[in-house]
Interface confidence: low
C-alpha cells in the first residue's frame, strides 16, 4: 500500500502480483464518516493509473477491471473529489505484473585451481520482472548434499564454497538450479560431472627462457603449473604480430624447447594447462612473458650499387652504395659494414669498417682491374659479402637499353619503360634502373637510388624518394656479365609552370652575333623537368611582337648565340624556361645594342 | 597482404576538423604508398591524399591547405588530419595501401572505409 488509507481502502484481485496478461479487480472503499462532508451522495471516487483517470463513481466504494497491463510496476491512486475542494487522496496500490521462472538453461560449474571452490553458472531465460529466489543444489557420493540460495533479481551465478578434492578424481556429483517466484517455480535439468570435469587448473607462473649458449637454436621455455596438470599448450607470436603460433605439449612438466624462433625477435610467450586429455577445461592463458631472442649472424646479401666519377687522366673517383639488410636477414643490431677494394691483377687490398653510413667514396687509379666486396656486421658475425666487379657501366654500347621513356603514375611514381638492347637481349643478366635528382653542377652528395630487374621485365616503378615537382636524372643499365650499356632520361612525377625565368648575366658581342650567358633557375623553382629555354626579343620601344628563339634543355648549358640582331639597334632581352605543363614566367629583362657592321 | 583498419570517421560542423587514421598490419615492409580515397554514393572512388615511402604528399585539389596526411613509422599508421571541413567532403573514407615490387602492382589493399559526415 502507498500510504496509512485512513479514509478508505483499496483492494486488488486476484494479487498485487498477476500474470503478464491477467486481468485484476480493483475496488476503491471508504470508510464510515470519510466521504464529503453532509452530501454523502455527492462523493466522487476516481481511479487513477499513475496520473491518468482510468474510472469514478458517485458513492462510498468504486470497482474497476483492469486488462493489459505491461511487464512491470504499474501505481493506482484513489482519490475523493467533493464540490468546492480540491481532490483528496484515500489509498493506492501497486501492481506487479510479471512471468513465472523459465526453466534455467546450460547450467554449468567449474572450480578454479586445485584449491578453489565450486561456483556454479545458469542462464535465467526471459526476465521475470519479478523478485525470484534460486537454490542451488549439490548432490555428492554417501548422500552428501550441499544447497546455496541467492535473492539477487538477476542471479546466474552461485559459489558453494566447498573444495572438491581429487581422492576419488570419477566420483559422480550432480547440480541443481531451482527458480521460484510468485507466479510459479522452474528447475534446470541436472548437470552431472567429476572433479576432472570441472577442475580448471589456475594459469600456469613463473614463466621463464632460456637461451643456451646465446643460441636462438636451443631455447627452453620454463614455467609453474598445479601439481595434476597433464596437458600444456604453449603460444607465442613476435610482438608486432597478431598471429599465435600454437604448440601442445603432454606431460611437460614445466618445460619445453622452441626450435623455430627468429633470431633478434621480441617475443610473447603464453602458457595453458589441463588436467586431462578430453575432460576438464583449459585454464586460462598466463600472463605475458616478453624476451628477445638473441642475435645470429646475418643472412642475406647486400644490395650493393656504385657510380664512377672521372677526376683526371690518372685518378677516378668510385662512390660505393648498399641498401640497408631487412631486419629478418641482419638478425641483430648491425654495427658495421667491411668493405674490401681490391686490385684484381696486383692483388693490392684495401679493407675498411663503416659505420653509420650505407655509403663509402674513394679515389683509385684509371688503371688495373679493381673489384669490391661489401658485407654487414652483427655482433653474431657478417653476411656474406657482395662482390662487385668495377667496370665502366655505360661502355658497350651495343647494350644500352633502347626507348627509354619516364612517365608520371600516379602520385609520387614514375613508371620507366624501355625495349631490350640490340646486342642479343637474352645476354643481358639484369637492368638496374637508378635515379638521382637532377642537379645542374653535377653535385654527387645528392642520394643515389636503384631498383633491380629480371632481364625479361622492360618497364619499373620507381617510387622510393620521389617528391613531386623535383626532376630526376634516371638512368637504366643492362648489364651482361663484365660489361654495361647505359641509357638516361629525366622524369618526374608531377609537375607544374616553372616558378621563375633564367636570369640573364651577360650579353657579349662575337663577330656580328650575340653570346647570352643566364643563370640556372633554382631547382626548387623548376618545378619539374625542364624541356626548353625560350630567348626573347625586341628592339626597345617598338610595339611589334619580340622574336624568340627556342633550345632544348640541357643539364650543363649555360649560354647560347643569336645572330638575328641588326646592327646599332638597341634590343630587350629575357628568358623563360618550359616544362610538359607550361611555361614560366618571364626572368630579368636586358638591353643590348650591336656595335658591328650589318652583314 | 596488408590489414588496415580505419577509425576517426564521424559527424562534425561545417569548419570542423577530424583526424582518420589508418593502421596497416600484415605484409607492411612491402608498401610504397599509402592514401587516403573518398567515395559518395553513386560516384567514382576518388583519391584524396597520398603518402610514398620517401615521405612525400600529394593531395586532389579541392583539399589542398586544408587536409594534411602524415604518418607514425613506429605504429605503422597513416593520419589524415582534416581541418576546415565543407558539406562536399562528405563520403566514406577508404585506407588504401599500394606494394609495388619491379614496376607492378602487387598488392592493393583496402580498408572497410569510414563515414565522414559534415553538415550543420
Known amino acids: 500500500k502507498i500510504d496509512a488509507c485512513k479514509r478508505g481502502d483499496v483492494t486488488v484481485k486476484p494479487s498485487h502480483v498477476i500474470l503478464l496478461g491477467s486481468t485484476v479487480n480493483i475496488t476503491c472503499s471508504l470508510k464510515p464518516r470519510q466521504g464529503c462532508f453532509h452530501y454523502s451522495r455527492r462523493n466522487k471516487l476516481i481511479l487513477y493509473k499513475f496520473d491518468r483517470r482510468i474510472n469514478f463513481h458517485h458513492g462510498h466504494s468504486l470497482n474497476s477491471q483492469v486488462t493489459g497491463l505491461p511487464l512491470g510496476t504499474t501505481l493506482f491512486v484513489c482519490k475523493l473529489a467533493c464540490i468546492n475542494s480540491d481532490e483528496i487522496q484515500i489509498c493506492g496500490a501497486e501492481i506487479f505484473v510479471g512471468v513465472a521462472p523459465e526453466q534455467p538453461q546450460n547450467l554449468s560449474c567449474i572450480q578454479k585451481g586445485e584449491q578453489g571452490t565450486v561456483a556454479c553458472t545458469w542462464e535465467r531465460g526471459r526476465d521475470t520482472h519479478l523478485y525470484t529466489e534460486y537454490t542451488l543444489q549439490l548432490s555428492g557420493p554417501k548422500n552428501l548434499t550441499w544447497q546455496k540460495q541467492c535473492k539477487d533479481i538477476y542471479c546466474d551465478y552461485l559459489d558453494f564454497g566447498i573444495n572438491l578434492t581429487p581422492e576419488s578424481p570419477e566420483s559422480n556429483f550432480t547440480a541443481k538450479v531451482t527458480a521460484v517466484n510468485s507466479l510459479g517455480s522452474s528447475s534446470s535439468l541436472p548437470s552431472t560431472f567429476t572433479f576432472l570435469d570441472i577442475v580448471r587448473p589456475l594459469p600456469p607462473w613463473d614463466i621463464r627462457i632460456k637461451f643456451q649458449k646465446a643460441s636462438v637454436s636451443r631455447c627452453t621455455l620454463y614455467w609453474r603449473d598445479e601439481g595434476l596438470v597433464l596437458l600444456n599448450r604453449l603460444r607465442y607470436r613476435p610482438s608486432n604480430s597478431r598471429l599465435w603460433n600454437m604448440v601442445n605439449v603432454t606431460k611437460a612438466k614445466g618445460r619445453h624447447d622452441l626450435l623455430d624462433l627468429k633470431p633478434f625477435t621480441e617475443y610473447e610467450f603464453q602458457i595453458s594447462s589441463k588436467l586431462h586429455l578430453y575432460k576438464g577445461s583449459w585454464s586460462d592463458w598466463s600472463e605475458s612473458l616478453r624476451a628477445q631472442t638473441p642475435e645470429e649472424e646475418p643472412t642475406g646479401m647486400l644490395d650493393v650499387w656504385y657510380m664512377k666519377r672521372h677526376i683526371d687522366y690518372s685518378r677516378q673517383q668510385i662512390s660505393l652504395f648498399w641498401k640497408n639488410l631487412s631486419v629478418s636477414e641482419a638478425r641483430g643490431k648491425i654495427l658495421h659494414y667491411q668493405v674490401t677494394l681490391q686490385e684484381l691483377t696486383g692483388g693490392k687490398a684495401m679493407t675498411q669498417n663503416i659505420t653509420g653510413h650505407t655509403s663509402w667514396t674513394t679515389v683509385i687509379p684509371r688503371t688495373g682491374n679493381w673489384a669490391v666486396a661489401v658485407s654487414a656486421a652483427n655482433s653474431k658475425g657478417s653476411s656474406l659479402p657482395t662482390r662487385i666487379n668495377i667496370m665502366n657501366l655505360c661502355e658497350a654500347g651495343l647494350l644500352a637499353p633502347r626507348q627509354v621513356s619516364a612517365n608520371s603514375e600516379g602520385m609520387d611514381n614514375i613508371l620507366v619503360t624501355w625495349q631490350p638492347p640490340r646486342k642479343d637481349p637474352s645476354a643481358v643478366q639484369e637492368y638496374v634502373v637508378e635515379w638521382r635528382e637532377l642537379h645542374p653542377g653535377g653535385d654527387t652528395q645528392v642520394p643515389l637510388n636503384w631498383l633491380r630487374s629480371r632481364p625479361y621485365n622492360v618497364s619499373a616503378l620507381i617510387s622510393e624518394n620521389i617528391k613531386s615537382y623535383i626532376c630526376y636524372e634516371i638512368r637504366v643499365y643492362a648489364l651482361s656479365g663484365d660489361q654495361g650499356g647505359c641509357s638516361s632520361i629525366l622524369g618526374n612525377s608531377k609537375h607544374k609552370a616553372p616558378l621563375s625565368g633564367p636570369h640573364i648575366n651577360a650579353i657579349t658581342e662575337e663577330k656580328g652575333s650575340i653570346l647570352i650567358s643566364w643563370n640556372s633557375i633554382p631547382v626548387q623553382e623548376q618545378m619539374g623537368c625542364l624541356l626548353h629555354y625560350r630567348i626573347y626579343w625586341k628592339e626597345r620601344d617598338s610595339n611589334s611582337q619580340p622574336q624568340l628563339c627556342e633550345i632544348p634543355y640541357r643539364v650543363s648549358q649555360n649560354s647560347h648565340p643569336i645572330n638575328s640582331l641588326q646592327p646599332r639597334v638597341t634590343y630587350v632581352l629575357w628568358m623563360t624556361a618550359l616544362t610538359a605543363a607550361g611555361e614560366s614566367s618571364h626572368g630579368n629583362e636586358r638591353e643590348f645594342c650591336l656595335q658591328g657592321k650589318a652583314n | 597482404q596488408v590489414q588496415l583498419q580505419e577509425s576517426g570517421g564521424g559527424l562534425v560542423q561545417p569548419g570542423g576538423s577530424l583526424r582518420l587514421s589508418c593502421a596497416a598490419s600484415?605484409?607492411?615492409?612491402?608498401?610504397?604508398?599509402m592514401g587516403w580515397y573518398r567515395q559518395v554514393p553513386g560516384k567514382q572512388r576518388e583519391l584524396v591524399a597520398e603518402?610514398?615511402?620517401?615521405?612525400?604528399?600529394t593531395y586532389v585539389d579541392s583539399v589542398e591547405g586544408r587536409f594534411t596526411i602524415s604518418r607514425d613509422n613506429a605504429k605503422n599508421t597513416v593520419y589524415l588530419q582534416m581541418n576546415s571541413l565543407k558539406p562536399e567532403d562528405t563520403a566514406v573514407y577508404y585506407c588504401?595501401?599500394?606494394?609495388?615490387?619491379?614496376?607492378?602492382?602487387?598488392?592493393?589493399?583496402w580498408g572497410q572505409g569510414t563515414q565522414v559526415t559534415v553538415s550543420s
Open positions: 603518402m610514398s615511402t620517401g615521405g612525400s604528399t
Open positions: 588504401n595501401a599500394k606494394a609495388w615490387q619491379l614496376g607492378r602492382l602487387e598488392n592493393d589493399d
Open positions: 600484415g605484409s607492411i615492409l612491402r608498401i610504397n604508398l
